[in-house]
């Protein structure tokens, strides 16, 4: 009678939207990688449903993923990076839906820190600083960087700038004065990987110096 | 209808070097892995090396870890295979392979003849 009752289930399940999409991230944690899926429809019931990632893999066939509340997580040295790979949602035994992906095509960066804006005086600049833990990396070194500030009265009103190192210069005459200012950044790879931004670094808030009214120059 | 095309195999003589390349007409050639496979006389088929799309990353067999270099240019659809150091147990027929797909190589080219005299 039970098997009667999961097949109905295994029925209803075939007619539910399962597309997923994933992220890898490259020694995430020292040598480890990992790779995370997630239900594009966050109204699918995943009670019963796997996700399973087969091929390009060292040492092993396949590797499931952990269940963390409602995404799919992999931590593990075992991605080869070189190939394609058969990633599937799964009941039991049975794929629903399958996607086969290149690791190294749908990678996301660790957000950028440890950002700071210094004003300096002698050059009417700000000097814009920020530290990334992809330096230090085997993999994904060559990132860009996107860096987006605003003033905090404008709600969408953002200024991007684009660049590959972790240093820029914004000169005082493009700011309002005696204004309050948001900046963060992001990054995605921009060599030999492809994929997706990063989460935005923490915001950082500045202040730019009022104008003197002598000179019409800000202070 | 050729689709790999292996050249730079031929005699020489235990010590030194020789550059294999492979010619890819398939035009995913930018977004697929390559490998390279070689067969000793009377033996199975042994792969090698292996390099990702971009070729950030490669991967070697223990037996030539340190005397073979894979690499590849993606403008000319070629793989190559940098052979230093060459011994005798070298020889063979030397196969590049495109796409790895799931642990299954989709495309073989017909091989080059490699010999090393002791």
């Known amino acids: 009678e039970s098997g009667y009752a999961q097949n109905g289930d295994l029925e209803d399940a075939e007619l539910d939207d399962y597309s997923f999409s994933c992220y890898s991230q490259l020694e995430v944690n020292g040598s480890q990688h990992s790779l995370t899926c997630a239900f594009e429809d966050p109204d699918v019931n995943t009670t019963n449903l796997e996700f399973e990632i087969c091929g390009a893999l060292v040492e092993v066939k396949c590797l499931n993923f952990r269940k963390l509340q409602e995404i799919y997580f992999i931590e593990t040295k075992k991605f080869l990076l070189i190939g394609k790979s058969n990633i599937c949602v799964k009941v039991g035994e049975k794929s629903l839906t399958c996607k086969k992906i290149d690791l190294t095509t749908i990678v996301k960066p660790e957000a950028p820190f440890d950002l700071s804006v210094i004003y300096r005086e002698g050059a009417n600049d700000f000097v814009v600083t920020f530290n990334t833990s992809h330096l230090q990396k085997k993999y994904v070194k060559v990132l860009m960087h996107d860096v987006a500030y605003r003033q905090e009265k404008d709600e969408n009103k953002w200024t991007h700038v684009n660049l590959s190192s972790t240093k820029l210069t914004l000169l005082q005459r493009k700011l309002q004065p005696a204004a309050m200012y948001e900046i963060k950044v992001r990054s995605i790879p921009d060599h030999y990987f492809k994929g997706f931004w990063s989460e935005w670094s923490p915001s950082y808030y500045f202040r730019t110096p009022e104008i003197n009214n002598s000179s019409g120059e800000m202070d | 209808e050729v689709q790999l095309v292996e050249s730079g195999g031929g005699l020489v003589q235990a010590g030194g070097s020789l550059r294999l390349s492979c010619e890819s007409s398939i035009s995913t050639f930018s977004s697929d892995a390559m490998g390279w496979f070689r067969q000793a006389p009377g033996k199975g088929l042994e792969w090698l090396a292996a390099i990702g799309w971009s070729g950030a990353v490669t991967h070697y067999s223990d037996s030539v870890k340190g005397r073979f270099t894979i690499s590849r240019d993606n403008a000319k659809n070629t793989v190559y295979l940098q052979m230093n150091s060459l011994k005798a147990e070298d020889t063979g027929r030397y196969y590049c392979?495109?796409?790895?797909?799931?642990?299954?190589?989709?495309?073989w080219g017909q091989g080059t003849q490699v010999t090393v005299s002791s």
């Open positions: 392979a495109e796409d790895y797909d799931t642990d299954v190589w989709q495309y």
